[in-house]
Interface confidence: medium
Amino acid sequence: TPTTLASHSTKTDASSTHHSSVPPLTSSNHSTSPQLSTGVSFFFLSFHISNLQFNSSLEDPSTDYYQELQRDISEMFLQIYKQGGFLGLSNIKFRPGSVVVQLTLAFREGTINVHDVETQFNQYKTEAASRYNLTISDVSVSDVPFPFSAQSGAGVPG
């Protein structure tokens, strides 16, 4: 499964300042998501890209359509979570329904929580439309149950 790793992973401390459009949970941004012993928190994220159409190319990682969309999404997440702690994303899946994107985000333990993952992604939707021509809707974020299968990813949250 394709994986994108963030090139930076410096931990945000309790007094760190988020960029102005992003309200964090608190001044000290802690996580209670399921965590591995290596200190990594995982979040399952699903959203619709309503201005794209799903076709069979998105079932084949070797196609240009798949690779371009995966690249844009990976770059977008590096922009959204550019404060320290974002480790990358994995298990990208594309589904029918315009295009439904499902993926898993990884953060260093203690740097973010599920509330802030969703808030920051929602705050970025307008910029995503202009920068990547992706019209995003129906965002859903949840803690990944632990243990989970790295092959299958997390199930679609209820």
Partner: antibody, heavy 122, light 107 residues
Framework: EIQLVQSGAEVKKPGSSVKVSCKVT?????????WHWMRQAPGQGLEWIGY???????SYNPSLKSRATLTRDTSTNTFYMELSSLRSEDTAFYFC???????????????WGQGTLVTVSS | DIQMTQSPSTLSASVGDRVTITCRAS??????IHWYQQKPGKAPKLLIK???ESISGVPSRFSGSGSGTEFTLTISSLQPDDFATYYC?????????FGQGTKVEVK
Amino acid sequence: EIQLVQSGAEVKKPGSSVKVSCKVTGHSITRGSSWHWMRQAPGQGLEWIGYIHYGGGTSYNPSLKSRATLTRDTSTNTFYMELSSLRSEDTAFYFCARYSYDITYRWFFDVWGQGTLVTVSS
Amino acid sequence: DIQMTQSPSTLSASVGDRVTITCRASQNIGTSIHWYQQKPGKAPKLLIKYASESISGVPSRFSGSGSGTEFTLTISSLQPDDFATYYCQQNNNWPLTFGQGTKVEVK
């Protein structure tokens, strides 16, 4: 002015479910806040149940062991809390509240509903 | 979960008294604590946010202080309208948790 108006009191049998609503006026539930539920047993303190985010995601207090389900209806600007497998210990006032943020982007509960008494009794 | 312990559970006081309520967190929460006032049959009302920050419309006699694990809410001169139950609440971590409450009653 933002207001949160909750549905009326309920009396339920053990093992059944209850669904409490919270209608929001003066602010869209799809914009910039998350929407939470708390409960308070008679004479007791407050317990956080969970939230539905303005983006639609939900999170719950593990203490409720998946008995709580939070949903919303964006067409009526209303959000809901359903609690299943009711037992007598669930008898409480249930409060909805807006979790908002100030100019320094820090979160707190600034507006609350009036409360809904749910009584579980055989 | 972070436990929030308030003391005392009940406080008897008279109008004009200076009243102090303490809240202790089970771990360091910085200043991520809020104080609420609740009257019987009513919803809680926010008094102080982030340990010491005042809320518009709340009388200046209410103040808060502390950081880390020890916090206080002070009412400088108790008024008849202040007889109520007071709660602290942390939002340093999920799940959000509240203290068990301090009831301020007439002496």
